[in-house]
Protein backbone atom coordinates (compact mmCIF):
# COMPACT_ATOMS: atom_id res chain seq x y z
CA UNK A 1 0.00 0.00 0.00
CA UNK A 2 1.22 3.50 -0.79
CA UNK A 3 -0.08 7.05 -0.47
CA UNK A 4 1.41 10.05 -2.29
CA UNK A 5 0.73 13.75 -1.77
CA UNK A 6 2.68 15.63 -4.43
CA UNK A 7 1.78 19.14 -3.28
CA UNK A 8 4.19 20.18 -0.54
CA UNK A 9 2.49 23.53 0.07
CA UNK A 10 -0.41 25.57 -1.28
CA UNK A 11 -1.30 29.20 -0.72
CA UNK A 12 -4.85 30.45 -1.18
CA UNK A 13 -6.77 33.57 -0.11
CA UNK A 14 -9.61 33.40 2.40
CA UNK A 15 -13.13 32.68 1.13
CA UNK A 16 -11.75 30.80 -1.87
CA UNK A 17 -11.64 27.02 -2.27
CA UNK A 18 -8.59 24.79 -2.40
CA UNK A 19 -8.12 21.25 -3.64
CA UNK A 20 -5.49 18.97 -2.11
CA UNK A 21 -4.52 15.93 -4.14
CA UNK A 22 -3.72 12.42 -3.01
CA UNK A 23 -2.84 9.35 -5.07
CA UNK A 24 -2.76 5.87 -3.60
CA UNK A 25 -1.96 2.29 -4.44
CA UNK A 26 -3.59 -0.70 -2.81
CA UNK A 27 -4.26 -4.36 -3.31
CA UNK A 28 -7.25 -4.22 -0.96
CA UNK A 29 -10.70 -4.60 -2.46
CA UNK A 30 -12.49 -2.71 0.28
CA UNK A 31 -10.81 0.27 1.90
CA UNK A 32 -11.23 3.81 3.19
CA UNK A 33 -9.28 6.97 2.53
CA UNK A 34 -9.16 9.36 5.46
CA UNK A 35 -8.24 13.03 5.46
CA UNK A 36 -6.70 14.59 8.58
CA UNK A 37 -5.63 18.08 9.58
CA UNK A 38 -2.54 18.41 11.75
CA UNK A 39 -2.63 21.16 14.34
CA UNK A 40 0.52 23.07 15.41
CA UNK A 41 0.47 20.86 18.53
CA UNK A 42 0.88 17.89 16.13
CA UNK A 43 -2.56 16.63 17.10
CA UNK A 44 -4.37 15.02 14.15
CA UNK A 45 -7.98 16.02 13.57
CA UNK A 46 -10.17 13.74 11.46
CA UNK A 47 -11.94 15.60 8.65
CA UNK A 48 -13.66 13.21 6.27
CA UNK A 49 -13.69 9.59 5.13
CA UNK A 50 -14.18 8.17 1.63
CA UNK A 51 -15.31 4.58 1.20
CA UNK A 52 -13.89 2.67 -1.75
CA UNK A 53 -17.28 1.79 -3.21
CA UNK A 54 -19.23 4.81 -2.11
CA UNK A 55 -20.27 8.07 -3.72
CA UNK A 56 -18.15 11.17 -3.21
CA UNK A 57 -18.06 12.05 0.47
CA UNK A 58 -19.12 15.48 1.75
CA UNK A 59 -19.09 16.98 5.22
CA UNK A 60 -19.63 20.68 5.77
CA UNK A 61 -16.93 22.62 3.94
CA UNK A 62 -15.05 19.42 3.13
CA UNK A 63 -15.77 17.37 0.04
CA UNK A 64 -13.94 14.54 -1.68
CA UNK A 65 -13.59 13.97 -5.41
CA UNK A 66 -12.93 10.24 -5.65
CA UNK A 67 -11.65 8.71 -8.88
CA UNK A 68 -11.47 5.05 -8.06
CA UNK A 69 -10.01 3.66 -11.27
CA UNK A 70 -7.28 6.32 -11.25
CA UNK A 71 -6.77 5.80 -7.50
CA UNK A 72 -7.09 9.51 -6.84
CA UNK A 73 -8.86 11.12 -3.91
CA UNK A 74 -8.84 14.91 -3.74
CA UNK A 75 -10.01 16.96 -0.77
CA UNK A 76 -11.67 20.31 -1.48
CA UNK A 77 -12.04 22.84 1.32
CA UNK A 78 -14.49 25.59 0.44
CA UNK A 79 -14.92 29.08 1.90
CA UNK A 80 -11.41 29.06 3.32
CA UNK A 81 -10.80 30.56 6.74
CA UNK A 82 -7.51 31.60 8.35
CA UNK A 83 -7.77 28.70 10.78
CA UNK A 84 -7.64 26.28 7.84
CA UNK A 85 -3.93 27.02 7.60
CA UNK A 86 -2.39 23.69 8.58
CA UNK A 87 -0.79 20.51 7.29
CA UNK A 88 -3.16 17.99 5.71
CA UNK A 89 -2.66 14.25 5.44
CA UNK A 90 -4.50 11.54 3.58
CA UNK A 91 -4.35 8.00 4.89
CA UNK A 92 -5.41 4.61 3.59
CA UNK A 93 -7.04 1.98 5.77
CA UNK A 94 -9.17 -1.15 5.64
Amino acid sequence: QKVTQAQSSVSMPVRKAVTLNCLYETSWWSYYIFWYKQLPSKEMIFLIRQGSDEQNAKSGRYSVNFKKAAKSVALTISALQLEDSAKYFCALGE
Epitope: W29, S30, Q50, G51, S52, D53, E54, Q55, N56, A57, V64, N65, F66, K67, K68, A69, A70, K71, S72
Partner: antibody, heavy 118, light 106 residues
Protein backbone atom coordinates in the same frame (compact mmCIF):
# COMPACT_ATOMS: atom_id res chain seq x y z
CA UNK B 1 -27.99 18.63 -17.69
CA UNK B 2 -25.30 16.00 -18.03
CA UNK B 3 -25.00 14.51 -21.51
CA UNK B 4 -22.60 12.04 -23.07
CA UNK B 5 -22.87 12.24 -26.85
CA UNK B 6 -21.26 9.34 -28.67
CA UNK B 7 -20.13 9.14 -32.29
CA UNK B 8 -22.22 7.34 -34.89
CA UNK B 9 -22.32 3.71 -35.97
CA UNK B 10 -19.21 2.28 -37.63
CA UNK B 11 -18.78 -0.45 -40.22
CA UNK B 12 -15.12 -1.45 -40.54
CA UNK B 13 -13.04 -4.20 -42.10
CA UNK B 14 -11.26 -6.91 -40.07
CA UNK B 15 -7.71 -5.90 -39.16
CA UNK B 16 -8.48 -2.20 -39.22
CA UNK B 17 -8.65 0.23 -36.29
CA UNK B 18 -11.43 2.57 -35.25
CA UNK B 19 -11.73 5.46 -32.81
CA UNK B 20 -15.00 6.07 -30.99
CA UNK B 21 -15.69 9.41 -29.34
CA UNK B 22 -17.77 10.59 -26.39
CA UNK B 23 -18.39 14.31 -25.93
CA UNK B 24 -19.34 15.33 -22.41
CA UNK B 25 -21.42 18.36 -21.49
CA UNK B 26 -23.31 19.69 -18.48
CA UNK B 27 -20.53 19.11 -15.96
CA UNK B 28 -16.82 19.77 -15.41
CA UNK B 29 -15.18 17.16 -17.60
CA UNK B 30 -11.98 16.76 -15.56
CA UNK B 31 -13.86 16.16 -12.29
CA UNK B 32 -14.98 12.66 -13.26
CA UNK B 33 -13.44 9.57 -14.78
CA UNK B 34 -14.83 8.31 -18.06
CA UNK B 35 -15.43 4.57 -18.32
CA UNK B 36 -16.18 2.42 -21.35
CA UNK B 37 -18.33 -0.70 -21.51
CA UNK B 38 -18.89 -3.25 -24.28
CA UNK B 39 -22.26 -4.95 -24.76
CA UNK B 40 -22.87 -8.07 -26.84
CA UNK B 41 -25.65 -10.68 -26.77
CA UNK B 42 -23.12 -13.38 -25.87
CA UNK B 43 -21.01 -11.70 -23.19
CA UNK B 44 -23.43 -9.05 -21.93
CA UNK B 45 -21.94 -5.93 -20.37
CA UNK B 46 -18.16 -5.93 -19.98
CA UNK B 47 -16.09 -3.17 -18.42
CA UNK B 48 -13.26 -2.16 -20.76
CA UNK B 49 -11.47 0.49 -18.74
CA UNK B 50 -11.42 4.08 -17.55
CA UNK B 51 -9.50 7.31 -17.91
CA UNK B 52 -9.07 10.29 -15.62
CA UNK B 53 -9.29 13.23 -18.06
CA UNK B 54 -7.46 15.47 -15.61
CA UNK B 55 -4.27 13.40 -15.45
CA UNK B 56 -4.57 10.95 -18.32
CA UNK B 57 -4.24 8.05 -15.88
CA UNK B 58 -5.88 4.94 -17.30
CA UNK B 59 -7.00 1.58 -15.96
CA UNK B 60 -7.93 -1.40 -18.13
CA UNK B 61 -9.64 -4.72 -17.82
CA UNK B 62 -6.87 -7.23 -18.55
CA UNK B 63 -9.05 -8.72 -21.29
CA UNK B 64 -8.95 -5.46 -23.27
CA UNK B 65 -5.31 -4.50 -22.79
CA UNK B 66 -3.75 -4.20 -26.22
CA UNK B 67 -7.19 -3.99 -27.80
CA UNK B 68 -8.47 -0.69 -26.43
CA UNK B 69 -6.61 2.58 -25.89
CA UNK B 70 -8.32 5.35 -23.93
CA UNK B 71 -7.52 9.04 -24.31
CA UNK B 72 -9.20 12.32 -23.44
CA UNK B 73 -9.04 15.86 -24.73
CA UNK B 74 -9.71 18.41 -22.00
CA UNK B 75 -10.11 21.31 -24.41
CA UNK B 76 -13.08 19.71 -26.15
CA UNK B 77 -14.38 17.68 -23.17
CA UNK B 78 -14.20 14.56 -25.31
CA UNK B 79 -13.10 11.04 -24.43
CA UNK B 80 -11.88 8.62 -27.08
CA UNK B 81 -11.46 4.89 -27.34
CA UNK B 82 -9.35 3.38 -30.10
CA UNK B 83 -9.92 -0.29 -30.89
CA UNK B 84 -7.20 -1.98 -32.94
CA UNK B 85 -6.72 -5.19 -34.96
CA UNK B 86 -10.46 -5.55 -35.25
CA UNK B 87 -12.17 -8.91 -35.61
CA UNK B 88 -15.81 -9.98 -35.67
CA UNK B 89 -15.52 -10.49 -31.88
CA UNK B 90 -15.25 -6.71 -31.52
CA UNK B 91 -18.68 -6.17 -33.08
CA UNK B 92 -20.74 -4.72 -30.25
CA UNK B 93 -22.40 -1.67 -28.80
CA UNK B 94 -19.91 0.46 -26.88
CA UNK B 95 -20.98 2.86 -24.14
CA UNK B 96 -19.12 5.65 -22.43
CA UNK B 97 -20.33 6.01 -18.85
CA UNK B 98 -19.67 8.32 -15.93
CA UNK B 99 -19.36 6.98 -12.40
CA UNK B 100 -20.52 8.48 -9.14
CA UNK B 101 -17.45 8.20 -6.93
CA UNK B 102 -16.66 4.53 -6.47
CA UNK B 103 -20.30 3.57 -6.63
CA UNK B 104 -22.54 3.13 -9.67
CA UNK B 105 -22.64 4.64 -13.16
CA UNK B 106 -25.17 7.43 -13.22
CA UNK B 107 -24.81 8.69 -16.79
CA UNK B 108 -24.55 6.65 -19.98
CA UNK B 109 -23.96 7.68 -23.56
CA UNK B 110 -26.45 6.53 -26.17
CA UNK B 111 -24.02 3.88 -27.40
CA UNK B 112 -22.04 3.38 -30.60
CA UNK B 113 -22.68 0.29 -32.67
CA UNK B 114 -19.51 -1.16 -34.18
CA UNK B 115 -19.80 -3.79 -36.90
CA UNK B 116 -16.66 -5.56 -38.08
CA UNK B 117 -17.26 -7.28 -41.39
CA UNK B 118 -15.52 -7.89 -44.69
CA UNK C 1 -12.66 -10.56 -10.68
CA UNK C 2 -16.06 -10.95 -9.10
CA UNK C 3 -18.61 -12.88 -11.16
CA UNK C 4 -22.26 -11.91 -10.79
CA UNK C 5 -24.88 -14.58 -11.52
CA UNK C 6 -28.44 -13.44 -12.11
CA UNK C 7 -31.51 -15.62 -11.88
CA UNK C 8 -33.80 -16.36 -13.43
CA UNK C 9 -32.56 -15.47 -16.91
CA UNK C 10 -36.16 -14.88 -18.00
CA UNK C 11 -39.01 -13.96 -15.69
CA UNK C 12 -42.60 -14.01 -16.90
CA UNK C 13 -45.20 -12.20 -14.83
CA UNK C 14 -48.74 -10.91 -15.02
CA UNK C 15 -49.61 -7.27 -14.26
CA UNK C 16 -50.14 -6.73 -10.54
CA UNK C 17 -47.97 -9.70 -9.59
CA UNK C 18 -45.03 -9.45 -7.17
CA UNK C 19 -41.70 -10.51 -8.67
CA UNK C 20 -38.19 -10.93 -7.32
CA UNK C 21 -34.96 -11.42 -9.23
CA UNK C 22 -31.66 -12.27 -7.63
CA UNK C 23 -27.99 -11.53 -8.16
CA UNK C 24 -25.32 -13.69 -6.53
CA UNK C 25 -21.69 -12.63 -6.31
CA UNK C 26 -18.74 -15.04 -6.38
CA UNK C 27 -17.23 -13.09 -3.46
CA UNK C 28 -18.74 -10.81 -0.87
CA UNK C 29 -19.46 -7.25 -2.01
CA UNK C 30 -20.48 -4.17 -0.04
CA UNK C 31 -23.14 -2.87 -2.39
CA UNK C 32 -25.06 -3.92 -5.46
CA UNK C 33 -26.39 -1.61 -8.16
CA UNK C 34 -29.14 -2.32 -10.68
CA UNK C 35 -29.88 -0.98 -14.16
CA UNK C 36 -32.92 -1.24 -16.39
CA UNK C 37 -32.46 -1.59 -20.14
CA UNK C 38 -35.11 -1.58 -22.83
CA UNK C 39 -34.40 -2.65 -26.43
CA UNK C 40 -32.55 -0.01 -28.42
CA UNK C 41 -31.75 2.11 -25.35
CA UNK C 42 -28.84 2.52 -22.95
CA UNK C 43 -29.07 0.98 -19.50
CA UNK C 44 -30.56 3.37 -16.93
CA UNK C 45 -29.51 3.55 -13.28
CA UNK C 46 -32.37 1.95 -11.36
CA UNK C 47 -31.25 1.05 -7.86
CA UNK C 48 -27.91 2.08 -6.36
CA UNK C 49 -26.07 1.12 -3.18
CA UNK C 50 -28.31 -1.95 -2.77
CA UNK C 51 -31.54 -0.21 -1.84
CA UNK C 52 -31.65 3.39 -3.06
CA UNK C 53 -33.98 4.15 -5.96
CA UNK C 54 -32.56 6.29 -8.73
CA UNK C 55 -34.39 9.48 -9.67
CA UNK C 56 -37.76 8.81 -11.27
CA UNK C 57 -37.92 5.11 -10.36
CA UNK C 58 -41.39 4.11 -9.09
CA UNK C 59 -41.73 3.18 -5.42
CA UNK C 60 -42.98 -0.30 -6.34
CA UNK C 61 -39.31 -1.19 -6.91
CA UNK C 62 -37.08 -2.12 -4.02
CA UNK C 63 -33.64 -3.61 -3.53
CA UNK C 64 -32.10 -5.56 -0.70
CA UNK C 65 -29.32 -7.96 0.19
CA UNK C 66 -25.84 -8.21 1.61
CA UNK C 67 -22.65 -10.22 1.23
CA UNK C 68 -23.05 -12.41 -1.84
CA UNK C 69 -26.83 -12.35 -2.26
CA UNK C 70 -28.87 -9.42 -3.52
CA UNK C 71 -32.33 -8.99 -4.97
CA UNK C 72 -34.57 -6.58 -6.83
CA UNK C 73 -38.29 -6.78 -6.11
CA UNK C 74 -41.27 -5.23 -7.87
CA UNK C 75 -44.31 -5.23 -5.58
CA UNK C 76 -46.91 -4.97 -8.36
CA UNK C 77 -45.60 -5.36 -11.89
CA UNK C 78 -46.79 -2.96 -14.56
CA UNK C 79 -46.49 -3.21 -18.35
CA UNK C 80 -43.82 -0.49 -18.47
CA UNK C 81 -41.55 -2.64 -16.27
CA UNK C 82 -40.91 -5.08 -19.13
CA UNK C 83 -37.15 -4.80 -19.65
CA UNK C 84 -33.84 -6.46 -18.85
CA UNK C 85 -32.39 -5.75 -15.41
CA UNK C 86 -28.64 -5.94 -14.79
CA UNK C 87 -26.82 -6.00 -11.47
CA UNK C 88 -23.38 -4.42 -11.07
CA UNK C 89 -20.72 -4.30 -8.38
CA UNK C 90 -17.59 -2.22 -7.89
CA UNK C 91 -16.36 -3.58 -4.60
CA UNK C 92 -13.45 -5.25 -6.39
CA UNK C 93 -10.85 -3.32 -8.36
CA UNK C 94 -12.89 -3.45 -11.54
CA UNK C 95 -16.64 -3.21 -12.07
CA UNK C 96 -18.51 -6.27 -13.25
CA UNK C 97 -22.07 -6.81 -14.44
CA UNK C 98 -24.48 -9.72 -14.28
CA UNK C 99 -25.83 -11.31 -17.46
CA UNK C 100 -29.27 -9.83 -16.83
CA UNK C 101 -32.81 -10.94 -16.03
CA UNK C 102 -35.35 -10.31 -18.76
CA UNK C 103 -38.77 -9.47 -17.37
CA UNK C 104 -41.62 -10.32 -19.71
CA UNK C 105 -45.27 -9.55 -19.10
CA UNK C 106 -47.97 -12.09 -19.83
Amino acid sequence: QVQLQQSGAELVRPGASVTLSCKASGYTFVDYEMHWVKQTPVHGLEWIGAIDPETGITAYNQKFKGKATLTADKSSSTAYMELSSLTSEDSAVYYCIRPRGGSHFDYWGQGTTLTVSS
Amino acid sequence: QIVLSQSPAILSASPGEKVTMTCRASSSVNYMHWYQQKPGSSPKPWIYATSNLASGVPARFSGSGSGTSYSLTISRVEAEDAATYYCQQWSSHQPTFGAGTKLELK
